[in-house]
C-alpha cells in the first residue's frame, strides 16, 4: 500500500546509573545500542496494525520502546496500557522522522503486558503493538511465606517456595499497635526458618530475594484485649494452610483454652497448645488452630474461648480465587495551589496487592496500610500540585484493578499568544477553565475597551500534561482590525490575565503581557 508510512520499532536498553525516576524526554541513564523490533504488518487484522517483536526484560531493568515514523506532515499519538491512556509526545529527529517513545523505568510485573500505540498522521491512522514480558518469570518467583508445625516440636517453620532461594526472617514484636512498625526498637528480627518463641504479641515471617520482600502475619486473637470493633476476618485460597493463634494470660494455671468452628470443637489433629510462665509469674497459654490445606467447608466463625476470659471470634473465608474489592469509579478533585491533599484508595484484597501510582507516564512507589476493619488504604501525596490524570493500578495473582483520578489546581489564568497573517490565538491553562474577551485598542479607545465579538472562536483541548485542559481563543483577522493592537483576556474566579498583540505587523509579532488580578 503506497499510503502506508515506513515504520521502525526499536528497543533501547538502559544501564541505570541513577536511581531517580526520569521523564520520557531526558533519560537518567546510559543507553545501549537500539535493537530493531521489526514491526511487521499484522495480517487479518481490522485496521492497520503493526506488531513489534516480543520484548523480554529483566526485573528492575529500564527500557525505552521507540517508534520511528517516516510519514509526511505532523503526527499525533496515544499510548494505551491495561485500559489506561497515557500521554504521548512525538518529536522529530534530524532525518525529520516522527519519534515516539515509551520509557519503562525499573521493570516490575505490574508494567508487563501489551502496550498499544495509536498514531494519527495526515495520511492515515494505524496501531502499533508491543508485548513486554519479564524474563525468567517462570524461574524467578517470590511467594508469600506460610507456616508449618515442626514435626514433634512446639515450633513453627516458615516456608516460602521462591526462586532464587529466599532469605527467611521472623519479625517479632512484644508491644502494642504503632510501636510494632518495621523500624521500631520494639521489633526484633531473627534470620532463621524455625521459631520456638511463639508467645509474642506480634509475629510475622518475611521472605526476600531479588524480586523483593513478602511477609505473612500470624493471625492472633488475644483474649486479654477487648475485641476489636470490627469483625476480624481472614481470607485464604483453597489449598492454603490456615493458622490462627489464640493467646491468653491469667494469674495462675487454672484455665483452659478451646477452639470451635461454628458450634463444633475442632478435631484433635487441628490444634496444639503451649504454655509458659511470664516474668511476673502469670501463666501465658496459646492455642493454635491449624488446617494444613483448607477446603471450602473450612469457612466459618472460629471462636477461641477460655474458662477465665470472654470468648472472641474471627471469620475465616475460603475463596477459590483471589480478589480486589474497591470502587473503580473515577474521581475528580479541585484544590488550591498550596492546599495539602492526598489521593487515596480504600480496598479489600486477597492475596495482598502489588500497586503503582502513575502520572504522566511516570510510576511512583505505592505504599499500603492495613485498617482495623479488614480494608487497606493506599495514599498518594507526591503530586507536587501538578494538574492532570493520576492512575492507581493494583494487582495480585488473580485480579487487577485500576482507578483514575483527575486533579485540577485552582489558579489564575496565564496567557500565551501567537499570531499569523490571518489570525491571532491566545492560550491559557488556568482553572476553573477561563472565559475570553477580545478588545481593540485605537485612538477612540486607548485603554482597549472596545470589545471585539466578531470572528472569535473559543475551544478547550487536552494538552501538555495528560488530563489537563487548556483553553484557547482565536480571533480571525478582518480589515477592521488589521494594523491595530488587540488585547485578549482570560478570566476566571481567581483573576484575569491579558496579552496585547499587534496585528499584521512585519516581522515577529510583539506580545505584551498584562497581568490584572
Amino acid at each position: 500500500n503506497q499510503d502506508l508510512p515506513v515504520i521502525k520499532c526499536v528497543l533501547i536498553n538502559h544501564k541505570n546509573n541513577d536511581s531517580s525516576v526520569g521523564k520520557s524526554s531526558s533519560y537518567p541513564m546510559v543507553s545501549e545500542s537500539p535493537e530493531d523490533l521489526g514491526c511487521a504488518l499484522r495480517p487479518q487484522s481490522s485496521g492497520t496494525v503493526y506488531e513489534a517483536a516480543a520484548v523480554e526484560v529483566d526485573v528492575s531493568a529500564s527500557i525505552t520502546l521507540q517508534v520511528l515514523v517516516d510519514a509526511p506532515g505532523n503526527i499525533s499519538c496515544l499510548w494505551v496500557f491495561k485500559h489506561s491512556s497515557l500521554n504521548c509526545q512525538p518529536h522529530f529527529d534530524l532525518q525529520n522522522r516522527g519519534v515516539v517513545s515509551m520509557v519503562i523505568l525499573k521493570m516490575t510485573e505490574t508494567q508487563a503486558g501489551e502496550y498499544l500505540l495509536f498514531i494519527q498522521s495526515e495520511a492515515t491512522n494505524y496501531t502499533i503493538l508491543f508485548t513486554v514480558s519479564i524474563r525468567n518469570t517462570l524461574l524467578y518467583t517470590l511467594r508469600r511465606p506460610y507456616f508449618r508445625k515442626m514435626e514433634n516440636q512446639d515450633a513453627l517453620v516458615c516456608i516460602s517456595e521462591s526462586v532464587p532461594e529466599p532469605i527467611v526472617e521472623w519479625v517479632l514484636c512484644d508491644s502494642q499497635g504503632e510501636s510494632c512498625k518495621e523500624e521500631s526498637p520494639a521489633v526484633v528480627k531473627k534470620e532463621e526458618k524455625v521459631l520456638h518463641e511463639l508467645f509474642g504479641t506480634d509475629i510475622r515471617c518475611c521472605a526476600r530475594n531479588e524480586l523483593g520482600r513478602e511477609c505473612t502475619r500470624l493471625f492472633t486473637i488475644d483474649l486479654n484485649q477487648t475485641p476489636q470493633t470490627t469483625l476480624p476476618q481472614l481470607f485464604l485460597k483453597v489449598g492454603e494452610p490456615l493458622w490462627i493463634r489464640c493467646k491468653a494470660v491469667h494469674v495462675n494455671h487454672g484455665f483452659g483454652l478451646t477452639w470451635e468452628l461454628e458450634n463444633k470443637a475442632l478435631e484433635e489433629g487441628n490444634y496444639f497448645e503451649m504454655s509458659t510462665y511470664s516474668t511476673n509469674r502469670t501463666m501465658i497459654r496459646i492455642l493454635f488452630a491449624f488446617v494444613s490445606s483448607v477446603a471450602r467447608n473450612d469457612t466459618g466463625y472460629y471462636t477461641c474461648s477460655s474458662s477465665k476470659h470472654p470468648s472472641q471470634s474471627a471469620l475465616v473465608t475460603i475463596v477459590e480465587k483471589g480478589f480486589i474489592n474497591a470502587t473503580n469509579s473515577s474521581e475528580d478533585y479541585e484544590i488550591d495551589q498550596y492546599e495539602e491533599f492526598c489521593f487515596s484508595v480504600r480496598f479489600k484484597a486477597y492475596p495482598q496487592i502489588r500497586c503503582t501510582w502513575t502520572f504522566s507516564r511516570k510510576s511512583f512507589p505505592c505504599e499500603q496500610k492495613g485498617l482495623d476493619n479488614g480494608y487497606s488504604i493506599s495514599k498518594f501525596c507526591n503530586h507536587k500540585h501538578q494538574p492532570g490524570e493520576y492512575i492507581f493500578h493494583a494487582e495480585n495473582d488473580d485480579a487487577q484493578f485500576t482507578k483514575m483520578f483527575t486533579l485540577n489546581i485552582r489558579r489564575k489564568p496565564q496567557v500565551l499568544a501567537e499570531a499569523s497573517a490571518s489570525q491571532a490565538s491566545c492560550f491559557s491553562d488556568g482553572y476553573p477553565l477561563p472565559s475570553w474577551t477580545w478588545k481593540k485598542c485605537s485612538d477612540k479607545s486607548p485603554n482597549c475597551t472596545e470589545e471585539i465579538t466578531e470572528g472569535v472562536w473559543n475551544r478547550k483541548a487536552n494538552r501538555k500534561v495528560f488530563g489537563q485542559w487548556v483553553s484557547s481563543s482565536t480571533l480571525n483577522m478582518s480589515e477592521a482590525i488589521k494594523g491595530f493592537l488587540v488585547k485578549c483576556c482570560a478570566y476566571n474566579s481567581l483573576g484575569t490575565s491579558c496579552e496585547t498583540i499587534l496585528l499584521n505587523s512585519p516581522g515577529p509579532f510583539p506580545f505584551i503581557q498584562d497581568n490584572i488580578s
Partner: nanobody, 110 residues
Framework: QVQLQESGGGLVQAGGSLRLSCAAS???????MAWYRQAPGKQRELVAA???????LYGDSVKGRFVISRDNAKYTVFLQMNSLKPEDTAVYYC?????WGQGTQVTVSS
C-alpha cells in the same frame, strides 16, 4: 449474617435496676456472648460474659451487682443490673461471634 440488637437501656436513679436484652440472629448458640460497656472518653471494658466451661465471668466493678443469663431457644442474652451507680453510666454493647450490637445507653443519675 450475624446481627445483635440491644434493648432495655434508659435513665434510672442511683440504687435502681435495669434489665438489658440482646437478641441475636445468624448465630448458632449464645455460648460465647458477652456484655461490654463504654463510658465517654474511656476504653470499652468487659461487664459480663459466658466462659467455655459454662460458668460466668464479671468485670471487677460489677461483681455481685450484675447477672448475665440467657434464653438459648430465643437466642437472647440478658444483663440484670442492680444497685446501679452513677459510674455505671455508659453505652452497653452486646458481643458475639466477632460482631457488636449498636449499643444501648444507660444513664444513672445521682
Amino acid at each position: 449474617q450475624v446481627q445483635l440488637q440491644e434493648s432495655g437501656g434508659g435513665l434510672v436513679q442511683a440504687g435502681g435496676s435495669l434489665r438489658l436484652s440482646c437478641a441475636a440472629s445468624g448465630i448458632f448458640s449464645t455460648n460465647h456472648m458477652a456484655w461490654y460497656r463504654q463510658a465517654p472518653g474511656k476504653q470499652r471494658e468487659l461487664v459480663a460474659a459466658f466462659t467455655n466451661d459454662g460458668s460466668t465471668l464479671y468485670g471487677d466493678s460489677v461483681k455481685g451487682r450484675f447477672v448475665i443469663s440467657r434464653d438459648n431457644a430465643k437466642y437472647t442474652v440478658f444483663l440484670q443490673m442492680n444497685s446501679l451507680k452513677p459510674e455505671d453510666t455508659a453505652v452497653y454493647y452486646c458481643y458475639g461471634l466477632g460482631h457488636w450490637g449498636q449499643g444501648t445507653q444507660v444513664t444513672v443519675s445521682s
